[in-house]
Interface confidence: medium
């Protein structure tokens, strides 16, 4: 896992190699300058987009070589005891449902990318966060309602999935489902008044100042 120094370094993508090269070049040219990561990412992204297939080729070769290295090293790598069990994720297990904010992002990310093709991933995420914060609670409702329904479905699915796996796990699943319903009631956030008490937002949804659910 995180702490195993013997674990092979993860494989790098062609774009990651390109960014690494950019960084090295920048360091050579400006050894003492501190890097504005957001600006730097933006510039790299813009440059990558304008590069020809031929120019990108060298980085793709580097990525291919690194992939081969990673696969080779992983064949001989023995993870520490207990890690394999912990790390295993059943591909048949129900997927965690997306939050309202995530659903909102899925809808608006392509629009932002279309309007601002040069924006880095970080800047797109920042813009999405700002947009969500400035969205009135009534406009958030379709995402919240869909997220609530997906969450409900997930809780049923995960309880059924656990029941199939272990007889006593079903009970755990039901308890967990009830608990998360209670959590939802305790965190009825963003719906009505802006209040003196600070609201706790669910998961990765950004905090928002709003006045009601209408």
């Amino acid at each position: 896992g995180k702490g195993d120094p013997k674990k092979p370094r993860g494989k790098m993508s062609s774009y990651a190699f390109f960014v690494q090269t950019c960084r090295e070049e920048h360091k050579k040219k400006h050894p003492d300058a501190s890097v504005n990561f957001s600006e730097f990412s933006k510039k790299c992204s813009e440059r990558w987009k304008t590069m020809s297939a031929k120019e990108k080729g060298k980085f793709e070769d580097m990525a291919k070589a690194d992939k081969a290295r990673y696969e080779r090293e992983m064949k001989t790598y023995i993870p520490p005891k207990g890690e394999t069990k912990k790390k295993f994720k059943d591909p048949n297990a129900p997927k965690r449902p997306p939050s309202a904010f995530f659903l909102f992002c899925s809808e608006y990310r392509p629009k932002i990318k279309g309007e601002h093709p040069g924006l880095s991933i970080g800047d797109v995420a920042k813009k999405l966060g700002e947009m969500w914060n400035n969205t009135a609670a009534d406009d958030k409702q379709p995402y919240e309602k869909k997220a609530a329904k997906l969450k409900e479905k997930y809780e049923k699915d995960i309880a059924a999935y656990r029941a199939k796996g272990k007889p006593d796990a079903a009970k755990k699943g039901v308890v967990k489902a009830e608990k998360s319903k209670k959590k939802k009631e305790e965190e009825e956030d963003e719906e009505d008044e802006e209040d003196e008490e600070e609201e706790e937002d669910e998961e990765d949804e950004e905090e928002e100042e709003d006045d009601d659910d209408e």
Epitope: A136, D138, D139, Q141, P142, K145, K146, E185, E186, E187, E188, D189, E190, E191, D192, E193, E194, D195, E196, E197, E199, E209, D210, D211, D212, D213, E214
Partner: antibody, heavy 125, light 108 residues
Framework: AVQLVESGGGLVQPKESLKISCAAS????????MYWVRQAPGKGLEWVAR??????????YYADSVKGRFTISRDDSKSMVYLQMDNLKTEDTAMYYC????????????????WGQGVMVTVSS | YELIQPPSASVTPGNTVSITCSGD??????AYWYQQKPDKSIVRVIY???ERPSGISDRFSGSSSGTTATLTIRDTQAEDEADYYC???????????FGGGTKLTVLG
């Protein structure tokens, strides 16, 4: 306890103006959006106007039937919300309710649920 | 955008009655239900499709499926006689929408 008290209703002639008021107490007024809802005699409820809070630039919204004639405003320092009604028509005759969102048991809940007792506005020649 | 409710419904004491509310946006929007008694006082009985505010009898329940929201009152009492309005938000107007209201009569 939360209270919303409307005042200023009465009998006016068509094309005249009237301003109704709503005094709020018992909750943090500056943090709540405020609404006016009306009910014509023997008819259903109709949303008239909404005003949001300072962080939301006091944004206002109106029902199509009153757009351009009615103006909602608020005074956070006095916990008051107003509805200025100009160029009144006979079809504006109704009981006007001042309403606000509410919090239940420390949980933010949904739906407008503080209602005043209403004030009657009659437009007739 | 409209929310359609039946104008009237009737029930005998002790029985269950359901009032429906239909609207194209209801799959995406929450439904809220209000009770207006003959004295004109207004109380919210259901919010967010199926949540019941504190102080509201558990005889009142709400559900929503597709374009229809439903308010159900079981073991109906004489004091439940009132007008019931559904409401939903609608982002284009930035103002909510009310249904036309359903007059519930408790017979007997």
């Amino acid at each position: 306890a939360v209270q919303l008290v409307e005042s200023g209703g009465g009998l006016v002639q068509p094309k005249e103006s009237l301003k109704i008021s709503c005094a709020a107490s018992g909750f943090t007024f500056s943090n709540a959006a405020m609404y006016w809802v009306r009910q014509a005699p023997g008819k259903g409820l109709e949303w008239v106007a909404r005003i949001r809070t300072k962080p939301n630039n006091y944004a206002t919204y109106y029902a199509d039937s009153v757009k351009g004639r009615f103006t909602i405003s608020r005074d956070d320092s006095k916990s008051m919300v107003y509805l200025q009604m100009d160029n009144l028509k006979t079809e504006d005759t109704a009981m006007y309710y001042c309403t606000a969102p509410r919090r239940t048991e420390g949980i933010v809940s949904s739906g407008v649920d503080y209602w005043g007792q209403g004030v009657m506005v009659t437009v007739s020649s | 955008y409209e929310l359609i409710q039946p104008p009237s419904a009737s029930v005998t004491p002790g029985n269950t009655v359901s009032i429906t509310c239909s609207g194209d946006e209801l799959p995406k929007r929450y439904a809220y239900w209000y009770q207006q008694k003959p004295d004109k006082s207004i109380v919210r009985v259901i919010y967010k499709d199926s949540e019941r505010p504190s102080g509201i009898s558990d005889r009142f329940s709400g559900s929503s499926s597709g374009t229809t929201a439903t308010l159900t009152i079981r073991d109906t009492q004489a004091e439940d006689e009132a007008d019931y309005y559904c409401h939903s938000t609608y982002s284009d107007d930035k103002l909510p929408v009310f249904g036309g209201g359903t007059k519930l009569t408790v017979l007997g």
